[in-house]
Interface confidence: medium
Protein backbone atom coordinates (compact mmCIF):
# COMPACT_ATOMS: atom_id res chain seq x y z
CA UNK A 1 0.00 0.00 0.00
CA UNK A 2 1.34 3.46 -0.79
CA UNK A 3 2.38 5.73 2.02
CA UNK A 4 0.05 8.47 3.18
CA UNK A 5 0.52 12.02 1.95
CA UNK A 6 1.68 14.04 4.98
CA UNK A 7 -1.31 15.95 6.34
CA UNK A 8 -1.28 19.71 6.58
CA UNK A 9 0.00 21.14 9.83
CA UNK A 10 -3.46 22.39 10.76
CA UNK A 11 -5.13 19.03 10.24
CA UNK A 12 -2.39 17.21 12.10
CA UNK A 13 -2.78 19.72 14.90
CA UNK A 14 -6.55 19.24 14.91
CA UNK A 15 -6.35 15.45 15.08
CA UNK A 16 -3.78 15.51 17.86
CA UNK A 17 -5.83 18.03 19.83
CA UNK A 18 -8.97 15.93 19.44
CA UNK A 19 -7.00 12.90 20.60
CA UNK A 20 -5.76 14.86 23.59
CA UNK A 21 -9.32 15.87 24.50
CA UNK A 22 -10.84 12.41 24.15
CA UNK A 23 -8.06 10.62 25.99
CA UNK A 24 -7.64 12.99 28.92
CA UNK A 25 -11.16 13.57 30.19
CA UNK A 26 -11.26 13.45 33.97
CA UNK A 27 -14.85 14.74 34.21
CA UNK A 28 -17.68 15.18 31.69
CA UNK A 29 -16.28 17.34 28.90
CA UNK A 30 -17.67 20.88 29.03
CA UNK A 31 -19.90 19.79 31.92
CA UNK A 32 -21.84 17.53 29.60
CA UNK A 33 -22.88 20.38 27.29
CA UNK A 34 -24.91 19.33 24.24
CA UNK A 35 -24.24 20.50 20.67
CA UNK A 36 -25.90 19.96 17.32
CA UNK A 37 -24.68 16.88 15.49
CA UNK A 38 -23.32 17.52 12.01
CA UNK A 39 -23.11 15.68 8.72
CA UNK A 40 -19.47 14.70 8.39
CA UNK A 41 -19.13 15.69 4.76
CA UNK A 42 -17.65 18.56 2.77
CA UNK A 43 -17.64 21.73 4.81
CA UNK A 44 -17.49 19.83 8.07
CA UNK A 45 -14.84 22.12 9.59
CA UNK A 46 -17.16 25.09 9.41
CA UNK A 47 -20.12 23.01 10.57
CA UNK A 48 -18.08 21.66 13.48
CA UNK A 49 -17.05 25.16 14.43
CA UNK A 50 -20.64 26.39 14.21
CA UNK A 51 -21.64 23.71 16.69
CA UNK A 52 -18.72 24.09 19.08
CA UNK A 53 -18.72 27.88 19.05
CA UNK A 54 -22.00 27.80 20.94
CA UNK A 55 -20.26 26.13 23.89
CA UNK A 56 -18.95 28.82 26.18
CA UNK A 57 -16.76 28.66 29.25
CA UNK A 58 -15.16 25.35 28.29
CA UNK A 59 -11.41 25.82 28.17
CA UNK A 60 -10.86 22.20 27.08
CA UNK A 61 -12.11 22.97 23.57
CA UNK A 62 -10.68 26.47 23.11
CA UNK A 63 -7.74 25.18 21.10
CA UNK A 64 -10.01 23.02 18.95
CA UNK A 65 -12.20 26.04 18.23
CA UNK A 66 -9.12 28.05 17.26
CA UNK A 67 -7.83 25.33 14.92
CA UNK A 68 -11.27 24.99 13.30
CA UNK A 69 -11.34 28.77 12.77
CA UNK A 70 -8.18 28.35 10.73
CA UNK A 71 -9.65 25.50 8.69
CA UNK A 72 -12.99 27.16 7.98
CA UNK A 73 -12.75 29.62 5.07
CA UNK A 74 -15.48 31.94 6.31
CA UNK A 75 -16.21 33.77 9.53
CA UNK A 76 -18.32 31.87 12.01
CA UNK A 77 -20.16 33.37 14.94
CA UNK A 78 -22.34 31.95 17.71
CA UNK A 79 -25.89 31.12 16.70
CA UNK A 80 -24.96 30.56 13.08
CA UNK A 81 -26.14 27.30 11.47
CA UNK A 82 -25.54 25.67 8.12
CA UNK A 83 -27.41 22.94 6.30
CA UNK A 84 -24.75 20.51 7.51
CA UNK A 85 -26.25 20.43 11.00
CA UNK A 86 -28.56 17.60 11.91
CA UNK A 87 -30.90 20.04 13.62
CA UNK A 88 -33.01 17.40 15.35
CA UNK A 89 -30.06 15.69 17.04
CA UNK A 90 -28.01 17.00 19.93
CA UNK A 91 -25.13 15.05 21.38
CA UNK A 92 -22.65 15.61 24.18
CA UNK A 93 -19.50 17.52 23.27
CA UNK A 94 -17.42 14.45 24.18
CA UNK A 95 -19.25 12.31 21.62
CA UNK A 96 -19.11 15.10 19.04
CA UNK A 97 -15.33 15.37 19.44
CA UNK A 98 -14.79 11.62 19.19
CA UNK A 99 -17.06 11.31 16.14
CA UNK A 100 -15.12 14.09 14.42
CA UNK A 101 -11.82 12.45 15.34
CA UNK A 102 -12.79 9.05 13.98
CA UNK A 103 -14.10 10.62 10.79
CA UNK A 104 -10.87 12.53 10.25
CA UNK A 105 -8.90 9.35 10.82
CA UNK A 106 -11.03 7.62 8.21
CA UNK A 107 -10.42 10.43 5.72
CA UNK A 108 -6.70 10.17 6.27
CA UNK A 109 -6.81 6.43 5.73
CA UNK A 110 -8.59 7.00 2.43
CA UNK A 111 -6.15 9.69 1.39
CA UNK A 112 -8.62 12.58 1.55
CA UNK A 113 -6.72 15.31 3.29
CA UNK A 114 -8.70 18.45 2.51
Amino acid sequence: SPGPVPPSTALRELIEELVNITQNQKAPLCNGSMVWSINLTAGMYCAALESLINVSGCSAIYRTQRILHGLCPHKVSAGQFSSLHVRDTKIEVAQFVKDLLLHLKKLFREGQFN
Epitope: P2, G3, P4, E16, V19, N20, Q23, N24, Q25, F108
Partner: antibody, heavy 122, light 108 residues
Framework: EVQLLESGGGLVQPGGSLRLSCAAS????????MSWVRQAPGKGLEWVSA????????YYADSVKGRFTISRDNSKNTLYLQMNSLRAEDTAVYYC???????????????WGQGTLVTVSS | SYVLTQPPSVSVAPGQTARITCGGN??????VHWYQQKPGQAPVLVVY???DRPSGIPERFSGSNSGNTATLTISRVEAGDEADYYC???????????FGGGTKLTVL
Protein backbone atom coordinates in the same frame (compact mmCIF):
# COMPACT_ATOMS: atom_id res chain seq x y z
CA GLU B 1 1.37 -6.89 -0.02
CA VAL B 2 2.49 -5.90 3.47
CA GLN B 3 4.97 -8.34 4.98
CA LEU B 4 6.74 -8.34 8.34
CA LEU B 5 9.43 -10.93 9.01
CA GLU B 6 10.96 -11.25 12.46
CA SER B 7 14.32 -12.87 13.17
CA GLY B 8 16.91 -13.09 15.91
CA GLY B 9 15.06 -15.18 18.46
CA GLY B 10 16.61 -18.13 20.23
CA LEU B 11 17.80 -19.53 23.54
CA VAL B 12 19.69 -17.21 25.85
CA GLN B 13 20.80 -17.44 29.48
CA PRO B 14 19.37 -15.14 32.16
CA GLY B 15 21.27 -11.86 32.16
CA GLY B 16 22.14 -12.29 28.50
CA SER B 17 21.31 -10.18 25.47
CA LEU B 18 19.55 -10.67 22.17
CA ARG B 19 18.71 -8.44 19.23
CA LEU B 20 15.52 -8.98 17.29
CA SER B 21 14.98 -7.67 13.77
CA CYS B 22 11.83 -7.16 11.73
CA ALA B 23 12.17 -6.71 7.98
CA ALA B 24 9.23 -4.82 6.51
CA SER B 25 8.00 -4.58 2.93
CA UNK B 26 4.92 -3.59 0.96
CA UNK B 27 4.37 -0.16 2.52
CA UNK B 28 6.16 3.13 3.11
CA UNK B 29 7.99 2.06 6.25
CA UNK B 30 8.99 5.52 7.47
CA UNK B 31 5.39 6.75 7.45
CA UNK B 32 4.16 4.42 10.15
CA UNK B 33 4.86 3.75 13.79
CA MET B 34 5.96 0.21 14.60
CA SER B 35 5.70 -1.88 17.72
CA TRP B 36 6.81 -5.06 19.43
CA VAL B 37 4.22 -7.20 21.20
CA ARG B 38 5.02 -10.44 23.01
CA GLN B 39 3.11 -13.50 24.14
CA ALA B 40 4.38 -15.83 26.83
CA PRO B 41 3.48 -19.51 26.38
CA GLY B 42 -0.23 -19.98 27.10
CA LYS B 43 -0.69 -16.32 28.03
CA GLY B 44 -2.23 -13.22 26.47
CA LEU B 45 -0.75 -10.43 24.37
CA GLU B 46 1.58 -8.01 26.14
CA TRP B 47 2.73 -4.80 24.52
CA VAL B 48 6.48 -4.29 24.80
CA SER B 49 7.56 -1.16 22.94
CA ALA B 50 6.73 1.21 20.08
CA UNK B 51 8.52 3.76 17.95
CA UNK B 52 7.29 6.61 15.78
CA UNK B 53 7.81 6.63 12.02
CA UNK B 54 10.79 8.94 12.23
CA UNK B 55 12.25 7.12 15.19
CA UNK B 56 12.14 10.30 17.22
CA UNK B 57 9.69 9.02 19.83
CA UNK B 58 9.95 5.72 21.66
CA TYR B 59 7.65 4.08 24.20
CA TYR B 60 8.19 1.16 26.57
CA ALA B 61 6.18 -1.06 28.87
CA ASP B 62 7.22 -0.68 32.49
CA SER B 63 8.34 -4.32 32.57
CA VAL B 64 11.10 -3.72 29.99
CA LYS B 65 12.01 -0.06 30.48
CA GLY B 66 15.75 0.36 30.98
CA ARG B 67 16.51 -3.13 29.63
CA PHE B 68 15.09 -3.08 26.09
CA THR B 69 15.75 -0.54 23.35
CA ILE B 70 13.62 -0.15 20.23
CA SER B 71 15.08 1.40 17.09
CA ARG B 72 14.55 1.48 13.36
CA ASP B 73 16.57 1.97 10.19
CA ASN B 74 14.24 3.51 7.64
CA SER B 75 16.83 3.16 4.89
CA LYS B 76 16.73 -0.61 5.42
CA ASN B 77 12.99 -0.86 6.24
CA THR B 78 13.94 -2.67 9.43
CA LEU B 79 12.76 -2.50 13.03
CA TYR B 80 14.95 -3.66 15.92
CA LEU B 81 14.60 -4.62 19.56
CA GLN B 82 17.77 -4.79 21.61
CA MET B 83 17.08 -6.88 24.71
CA ASN B 84 19.56 -6.78 27.60
CA SER B 85 19.52 -8.22 31.13
CA LEU B 86 17.07 -10.87 30.01
CA ARG B 87 14.96 -12.68 32.59
CA ALA B 88 13.04 -15.94 32.55
CA GLU B 89 9.80 -13.95 32.42
CA ASP B 90 10.87 -12.44 29.09
CA THR B 91 10.38 -15.87 27.49
CA ALA B 92 7.76 -15.37 24.79
CA VAL B 93 6.99 -15.19 21.11
CA TYR B 94 7.84 -11.64 20.01
CA TYR B 95 5.71 -10.12 17.27
CA CYS B 96 6.52 -7.12 15.15
CA UNK B 97 3.40 -5.07 14.35
CA UNK B 98 2.68 -2.16 12.04
CA UNK B 99 0.61 0.72 13.38
CA UNK B 100 -2.42 1.68 11.34
CA UNK B 101 -2.03 5.45 11.37
CA UNK B 102 0.56 8.18 11.49
CA UNK B 103 -0.69 9.69 14.75
CA UNK B 104 0.81 7.55 17.46
CA UNK B 105 -1.97 7.92 19.96
CA UNK B 106 -4.46 6.35 17.55
CA UNK B 107 -2.46 3.17 17.28
CA UNK B 108 -4.10 -0.06 16.29
CA UNK B 109 -2.02 -2.73 14.58
CA UNK B 110 -3.20 -3.71 11.14
CA UNK B 111 -0.38 -6.09 10.19
CA TRP B 112 1.61 -8.54 12.31
CA GLY B 113 4.60 -10.74 11.65
CA GLN B 114 4.52 -14.44 12.45
CA GLY B 115 6.70 -13.96 15.52
CA THR B 116 10.07 -15.17 16.76
CA LEU B 117 10.51 -17.24 19.93
CA VAL B 118 12.81 -15.99 22.67
CA THR B 119 13.60 -18.47 25.43
CA VAL B 120 15.47 -17.29 28.51
CA SER B 121 16.71 -20.26 30.48
CA SER B 122 19.85 -21.59 32.11
CA SER C 1 -2.10 2.33 34.64
CA TYR C 2 -5.17 1.71 32.52
CA VAL C 3 -6.76 -1.75 32.78
CA LEU C 4 -8.97 -3.54 30.26
CA THR C 5 -11.10 -6.39 31.60
CA GLN C 6 -12.40 -9.20 29.39
CA PRO C 7 -14.28 -12.37 30.36
CA PRO C 8 -11.90 -15.34 30.13
CA SER C 9 -14.31 -17.36 28.03
CA VAL C 10 -17.50 -17.11 26.00
CA SER C 11 -19.37 -20.08 24.56
CA VAL C 12 -21.92 -19.96 21.77
CA ALA C 13 -23.70 -22.40 19.48
CA PRO C 14 -23.12 -22.20 15.72
CA GLY C 15 -25.41 -19.70 14.04
CA GLN C 16 -25.96 -17.75 17.24
CA THR C 17 -24.53 -14.38 18.24
CA ALA C 18 -21.44 -14.03 20.43
CA ARG C 19 -20.77 -10.85 22.40
CA ILE C 20 -17.36 -10.30 23.91
CA THR C 21 -17.02 -7.36 26.28
CA CYS C 22 -14.04 -5.20 27.19
CA GLY C 23 -14.42 -3.08 30.28
CA GLY C 24 -12.39 -0.02 31.16
CA ASN C 25 -12.88 3.26 32.97
CA UNK C 26 -14.57 5.62 30.50
CA UNK C 27 -13.47 3.39 27.65
CA UNK C 28 -16.06 5.16 25.49
CA UNK C 29 -13.65 8.09 25.38
CA UNK C 30 -10.95 5.89 23.92
CA UNK C 31 -10.56 4.25 20.53
CA VAL C 32 -10.81 0.48 20.72
CA HIS C 33 -9.34 -2.15 18.39
CA TRP C 34 -10.09 -5.89 18.40
CA TYR C 35 -7.87 -8.82 17.37
CA GLN C 36 -8.55 -12.46 16.66
CA GLN C 37 -5.84 -15.02 17.35
CA LYS C 38 -6.06 -18.68 16.44
CA PRO C 39 -3.70 -21.25 17.99
CA GLY C 40 -0.18 -21.03 16.63
CA GLN C 41 -0.96 -17.96 14.54
CA ALA C 42 -0.30 -14.24 14.76
CA PRO C 43 -3.14 -11.92 15.80
CA VAL C 44 -5.39 -10.47 13.10
CA LEU C 45 -7.14 -7.10 13.33
CA VAL C 46 -10.90 -7.71 13.03
CA VAL C 47 -12.34 -4.37 14.17
CA TYR C 48 -10.60 -1.00 14.43
CA UNK C 49 -11.66 2.46 15.57
CA UNK C 50 -14.45 1.03 17.75
CA UNK C 51 -16.59 -0.26 14.91
CA ASP C 52 -14.83 -0.31 11.53
CA ARG C 53 -13.87 -3.53 9.75
CA PRO C 54 -10.66 -4.04 7.77
CA SER C 55 -11.09 -5.32 4.24
CA GLY C 56 -11.44 -9.08 4.17
CA ILE C 57 -13.15 -9.32 7.55
CA PRO C 58 -16.73 -10.62 7.29
CA GLU C 59 -19.63 -8.30 8.03
CA ARG C 60 -20.57 -10.69 10.82
CA PHE C 61 -17.93 -8.94 12.94
CA SER C 62 -18.97 -5.61 14.43
CA GLY C 63 -17.98 -3.42 17.35
CA SER C 64 -19.45 -0.79 19.61
CA ASN C 65 -18.05 1.35 22.39
CA SER C 66 -19.69 3.60 24.96
CA GLY C 67 -19.56 4.32 28.66
CA ASN C 68 -17.36 1.80 30.41
CA THR C 69 -17.76 -1.09 27.97
CA ALA C 70 -16.68 -1.89 24.43
CA THR C 71 -18.25 -4.90 22.75
CA LEU C 72 -17.21 -7.15 19.88
CA THR C 73 -20.24 -8.83 18.35
CA ILE C 74 -19.96 -11.85 16.08
CA SER C 75 -23.26 -12.76 14.46
CA ARG C 76 -24.06 -16.12 12.85
CA VAL C 77 -21.06 -17.66 14.56
CA GLU C 78 -19.16 -20.33 12.64
CA ALA C 79 -16.79 -23.04 13.82
CA GLY C 80 -13.93 -21.10 12.22
CA ASP C 81 -14.54 -18.17 14.56
CA GLU C 82 -13.26 -20.21 17.50
CA ALA C 83 -10.21 -18.27 18.71
CA ASP C 84 -8.91 -15.91 21.36
CA TYR C 85 -10.07 -12.30 21.05
CA TYR C 86 -8.25 -9.28 22.48
CA CYS C 87 -9.30 -5.65 22.84
CA UNK C 88 -6.70 -2.89 22.77
CA UNK C 89 -6.47 0.84 23.40
CA UNK C 90 -3.81 3.52 23.69
CA UNK C 91 -3.55 5.01 27.19
CA UNK C 92 -2.35 8.57 26.85
CA UNK C 93 -1.80 9.03 30.58
CA UNK C 94 1.00 6.46 30.55
CA UNK C 95 1.89 6.52 26.82
CA UNK C 96 1.29 2.77 26.77
CA UNK C 97 -0.55 0.41 24.46
CA UNK C 98 -2.90 -1.67 26.60
CA PHE C 99 -4.36 -5.07 25.76
CA GLY C 100 -7.22 -6.82 27.49
CA GLY C 101 -6.52 -10.22 28.99
CA GLY C 102 -8.21 -12.00 26.11
CA THR C 103 -11.40 -14.02 25.71
CA LYS C 104 -11.49 -17.58 24.44
CA LEU C 105 -14.49 -18.03 22.16
CA THR C 106 -15.72 -21.61 22.06
CA VAL C 107 -18.18 -22.69 19.40
CA LEU C 108 -20.25 -25.51 20.88
Amino acid sequence: EVQLLESGGGLVQPGGSLRLSCAASGFTFSSYAMSWVRQAPGKGLEWVSAISGSGGSTYYADSVKGRFTISRDNSKNTLYLQMNSLRAEDTAVYYCAKADFWSGTLWGFDYWGQGTLVTVSS
Amino acid sequence: SYVLTQPPSVSVAPGQTARITCGGNNIGNKIVHWYQQKPGQAPVLVVYDDSDRPSGIPERFSGSNSGNTATLTISRVEAGDEADYYCQVWDSSSDHVVFGGGTKLTVL
